[in-house]
Each structure stands twice: as structure tokens, then as C-alpha cells.
């Protein structure tokens, strides 16, 4: 989103006696930030602290196991995606504090705000990959025994990253800095100018590929997985269900406001009242989406506590237990406790 419109009302008729002192805010916005911006700043601060520390810890735990444990490969890649996005937060935070002034230049404008979209696509594609892995473990255990290896997992992750980069390119290309004449301010945002159709196309593709299609496919995928695990009376299936639902739900819940406002704005005139209202909420929607970047480590810890009873172990060992247990593939009849547990621990991805 981030198109170039933050609203102030238009007052009355031309009045030459209405000249103001240049030191006073002339567009009827005070020097205090709007409530949505303040909330966004609070969320950004929390996400940065939890996201950087949490994902760094996850990377540290999984990096050592990634050579031999496929689950570790999944969680390592997810954590890297989240960690990278968190690195942009101090800049985005600073910009909001300065009333959306962007003093960081054109390259930073193209790259940094695009990181959250890269994260969205990378996360959902990695989650789809993980879900396919879960599905195959349940329904094609013999195939998994023969072909499911670390090499294939890394290839799948590389494909997911490649596709994510490709899908982020349109937003990256249309990001520009614009310097407003009065009040003097440099803004960073997307500018499609003449091409409203292209703006709509980008928004629709983002909604479909980054939200609706994954929502549909992952819902179907996990419905089948859970029905199978229940029918086999697999142990801990309710715990599995809870974790899977929590993980899937977190992605879609936190991206929902961003996706809805984005699609609405692409179909509205930039000067319409609804558009201007949605623009006020833009930073808040972005910050809400950013919660995805810190939620996974929290889910891992909560899941780990669930499996271990009380939190008796250290955080790294707890995470190691959750993230690096390898799924044991047996005959499909004996869909093992280990597989079910691993799913619970985070099929998590979604």
C-alpha cells in the first residue's frame, strides 16, 4: 500500500487575510501523531524486540540441525524471512515518528518497505511447502521414505524464495520518493500515476496469491491431515489441531487488514473520503501484518511449554526440542506419534 495520501480536510473559500505564520502547522494537522500511527509505533517496537531476538534464537537453534533435520530447514527459512523483515523496522519507525517524512533516499524506499511483502510471499510459500511435506508424510509415507531428504527440502525452499522475490518485484518497481513542495516533506510510497489498471492488478495478485489461494489450499490440506490423524486415533491430535489452527490462523488474521485495505484502495479514487480514511490506517495495517514476523517464535515457545509441561528447560533447548525433531516415516497405518508431534510443533508455518 503506502500510496501518497494522508488526509487533512479542505476548508472554505479563498481568503487572502487567512495568511498564517510559517511556524504554525498550516494543514490543520498538529505536531502530535495520529492514534493509528501511535499504535503502529508501539506494535513496531514490540515486533522488533521480539522478532529480532526470537528469530535470531530460532536461526541459531535450527542452523546446526539443518544438515540432518528437514523440519529444522523449514523453520530456519521461516525465521530468516521474519528476521530480515524485522531489520527494516527501525527505519519505518523513524519515518512514522517524523510524520511519514522519508530522509533515507530512493534505494531504501524501494527496498525496505518491500521486505514485508517479500516476507509475506516467502512465508506463505514456505508454509505451503511445509504443508505439502506434512501431507506427504501422512498420505505418501513410502514415497517420503525413499525421496524425502535435506537436499530436496533446500531445493523447495530455494524455489519458494525465488518465487517470493519475483512476486515482490512489482511493488518494488513502483516505489518512489516524492518531495512535496509545501509543507516540505519527502514521502516514500507506490506511485502508479497513469496506470490504475496495473495498480488493481498488483493488488488482486497480492490478494489471490498471498492470501485467498493459500487460505483455500491450506484449509483443505489440513482438513485432510487432521481427519486422517483423528481416524487413526493418533495421540495428541487435539494438541496438533490447536497448534495447526493457531499457526494457520495467525498468518491470515494478521494479513487480513492489510489485504482488505489494499484491495479497496486500488479501486478507490485517491481523493475520495474512504480512500483518505484508509490511508490514515495504512501504517497500522502494515504494523499489524508485521506481527507475523514475531509470532512464530512465540508459537514455538508456547507449543514447547505444552509438550514439556512447565517451562523447566532453557529456551534454546526447548526450541530445539520443538523445531528439530525429525518426522519418523513408517507404514501409513502406524502414523507415528513423532510425526503427529512434529506437525503440532509447527506445521506451523502457516
Amino acid at each position: 500500500m503506502d500510496s501518497f495520501n494522508y488526509t487533512t480536510p479542505d476548508y472554505g473559500h479563498y481568503d487572502d487575510k487567512d495568511t498564517l505564520d510559517l511556524n504554525t502547522p498550516v494543514d490543520k494537522t498538529s505536531n502530535t501523531l495520529r492514534v493509528p500511527d501511535i499504535l503502529a509505533l508501539v506494535i513496531f517496537a514490540v515486533v522488533f524486540l521480539v522478532g529480532v531476538l526470537g528469530n535470531a534464537l530460532v536461526v541459531w537453534v535450527t542452523a546446526f540441525e539443518a544438515k540432518r533435520t528437514i523440519n529444522a530447514i523449514w523453520f530456519l527459512n521461516l525465521a530468516v524471512a521474519d528476521f530480515l523483515s524485522c531489520l527494516a523496522l527501525p527505519i519505518l519507525f523513524t519515518s512514522i515518528v517524523q510524520h511519514h517524512h522519508w530522509p533515507f533516499g530512493g534505494a531504501a524506499c524501494s527496498i525496505l518497505p518491500s521486505l514485508i511483502l517479500l516476507n509475506m510471499y516467502a512465508s506463505i510459500l514456505l508454509l505451503a511447502t511445509i504443508s505439502a511435506d506434512r501431507f506427504l508424510l501422512v498420505f505418501k509415507p513410502i514415497w517420503c521414505q525413499n525421496f524425502r531428504g535435506a537436499g530436496l527440502a533446500w531445493i523447495a525452499c530455494a524455489v519458494a524464495w525465488g518465487l517470493a522475490l519475483l512476486l515482490t518485484i512489482p511493488s518494488f518497481l513502483y516505489r518512489v520518493v516524492r518531495e512535496e513542495y509545501f509543507p516540505p516533506k519527502v514521502l516514500c510510497g507506490v506511485d502508479y500515476s497513469h496506470d490504475k489498471r496495473r495498480e488493481r492488478a498488483v493488488a488482486i495478485v497480492r490478494l489471490v496469491l498471498g492470501f485467498l489461494w493459500p487460505l483455500l489450499t491450506l484449509t483443505i490440506c489440513y482438513t485432510f491431515i487432521l481427519l486422517r490423524t483423528w481416524s487413526r486415533r493418533a495421540t495428541r491430535s487435539t494438541k496438533t489441531l490447536k497448534v495447526v489452527v493457531a499457526v494457520v490462523a495467525s498468518f491470515f488474521i494478521f494479513w487480513l487488514p492489510y489485504q482488505v485495505t489494499g484491495i479497496m484502495m486500488s479501486f478507490l479514487e485517491p481523493s475520495s473520503p474512504t480512500f483518505l480514511l484508509l490511508k490514515k490506517l495504512d501504517s497500522l495495517c502494515v504494523s499489524f501484518a508485521y506481527i507475523n514476523c514475531c509470532i512464530n517464535p512465540i508459537i514455538y515457545v508456547v507449543a514447547g511449554q505444552g509438550f514439556q509441561g512447565r517451562l523447566r528447560k532453557s529456551l534454546p533447548s526447548l526450541l530445539r526440542n520443538v523445531l528439530t525433531e525429525e518426522s519418523v516415516v513408517r507404514e501409513s497405518k502406524s502414523f507415528t506419534r513423532s510425526t503427529v508431534d512434529t506437525m503440532a510443533q509447527k506445521t506451523q508455518a502457516v
Epitope: 495568511t19 498564517l20 498550516v26 494543514d27 512535496e180 516533506k185 506511485d191 500515476s193
Partner: antibody
Framework: QVQLQQSGPELVKPGASVKISCKAS????????MNWVKQRPGKGLEWIGR????????RYSGKFKGKATLTADKSSSTAYMQVTSLTSEDSAIYFC??????????????WGQGTTVTVSS | DVVMTQTPLSLPVSLGDQASISCRSS???????????LHWYLQKPGQSPKLLIY???NRFSGVPDRFSGSGSGTDFTLKISRVEAEDLGVYFC?????????FGGGTKLEIK
């Protein structure tokens, strides 16, 4: 009413400098920006830069950085533009233009009558 | 810089006719406060430009109601409903949304 009275025409030699004045009346000089615009036949209108008389803050178009210098004297409500190292390319009509700043609108509303600068040896 | 493209370059009209001048910008002129700072000026021979329309569609004080402005985003139009002799001259569109403020190349309104 708002008036911007510019200094008279100038005939100057290449390499020399010229300083044009613009006396404002009929409004609070410090509360609006003063812009300078260049007009050459067949070249349209070009924004040179602006000065905020209240604090002396200036902003120039990239093309005129180092070429034009804007100043303002609050006591006499007069804005000045000095153009240096003149060439035939600088032969033009130069306008001072008030940029009105109010709670309702930002617009270049009143223009001076223009100062013709001719660069010739 | 924002490029302002005016069409036509020259507009021959008969007195009493309607005239329409188009102005297109290379970037959106919607300001971050939601307003669009697109203005129209008329410059008569030997005079300085005079403001006619500010912020797309607002007539400046003393401007007759036969002048009207419209448009949004990047496409704008100035209409003169019934051209009078005093309307002849060069019309410029201008934007003051972005740095630097820029002007269209001008449209010369002349008698057919």
C-alpha cells in the same frame, strides 16, 4: 491589495552578475514564500527557487543551484535574486511570485510585472 | 521533475464558442493531505501570468464563472464556456504539489 513591484530592465555583459529586487506590499511579507520564475520565449516557465522571508530558508531548482541566490529583507519587505556568471542563456524575463500559505490552500497567486534581463556584449 | 504536458499547443476559437484545454502530469498530483495542487494561469501579451483556477476547480477572486476546471490524479481540463475577446492569451497549467513546481508549455487561445 497585494502588489509585487519589480526593478526595471537590465542590460548586462556576459560573465557579469545582476541583482533584481521585488518589493511586496498589501500582505504580511514574512508569512508567505517568495518564488522566482524564469520565462524565455519558446521555453515556457521555469521555477528557479523560493525563499521563506520569515527565516531566510531557501530552496533551489537543481538547474539554478550555484547560479541564483535568493535573499530577503524583512524590514523593507523586499526579496532579491542575484544571478551570476551570466550568459546568453540567462536572457529572459524574471518574475517574483508570491506563494500564499493559508490554512485552506497553498498557491502561487500574485506575480510581479517581470524584469527583463538581456545579456549582450 | 513532474512533466506537465498541455494540449493543444494552439487553440483557434470563435468568440462565444466553448474552449477546452487539457493538461496531463507525469506523476499523480495528489498531495499527502488529499488535495491536488493543480492551477491554471492566463498570460496576456506583455503581461505577467494571472491566476485563474487553483486546486483543480476553484476560481480565484474576480475570475468569471465561464472558467471552470476539472480532473484528478494526472489528467486535468480547463473549460471556457463562452470565449470573449479578453480571454485571448496563453494558458498555463502548473503544479505545486511536488518539488520543483512545474508548468505546462502553454496553450495559445486565438481567434479563428
Amino acid at each position: 491589495q497585494v502588489q509585487l513591484q519589480q526593478s526595471g530592465p537590465e542590460l548586462v555583459k556576459p560573465g557579469a552578475s545582476v541583482k533584481i529586487s521585488c518589493k511586496a506590499s498589501g500582505y504580511s511579507f514574512s508569512s508567505s514564500w517568495m518564488n522566482w520564475v524564469k520565462q524565455r520565449p519558446g521555453k515556457g516557465l521555469e521555477w528557479i527557487g523560493r525563499i521563506s522571508p520569515g527565516d531566510g530558508d531557501t530552496r533551489y531548482s537543481g538547474k539554478f543551484k550555484g547560479k541564483a541566490t535568493l535573499t530577503a529583507d524583512k524590514s523593507s519587505s523586499t526579496a532579491y535574486m542575484q544571478v551570476t556568471s551570466l550568459t546568453s542563456e540567462d536572457s529572459a524575463i524574471y518574475f517574483c511570485v508570491r506563494f500564499l500559505i493559508t490554512s485552506t490552500r497553498y498557491v502561487m497567486d500574485y506575480w510581479g510585472q517581470g524584469t527583463t534581463v538581456t545579456v549582450s556584449s | 521533475d513532474v512533466v506537465m504536458t498541455q494540449t493543444p499547443l494552439s487553440l483557434p476559437v470563435s468568440l462565444g464558442d466553448q474552449a477546452s484545454i487539457s493538461c496531463r502530469s507525469s506523476q499523480s498530483l495528489v498531495h499527502s493531505n488529499g488535495n491536488t495542487y493543480l492551477h491554471w494561469y492566463l498570460q496576456k501579451p506583455g503581461q505577467s501570468p494571472k491566476l485563474l483556477i487553483y486546486k483543480v476547480s476553484n476560481r480565484f477572486s474576480g475570475v468569471p464563472d465561464r472558467f471552470s476546471g476539472s480532473g484528478s490524479g494526472t489528467d486535468f481540463t480547463l473549460k471556457i464556456s463562452r470565449v470573449e475577446a479578453e480571454d485571448l492569451g496563453v494558458y498555463f497549467c502548473s503544479q505545486s504539489t511536488l518539488v520543483p513546481p512545474t508548468f505546462g508549455g502553454g496553450t495559445k487561445l486565438e481567434i479563428k
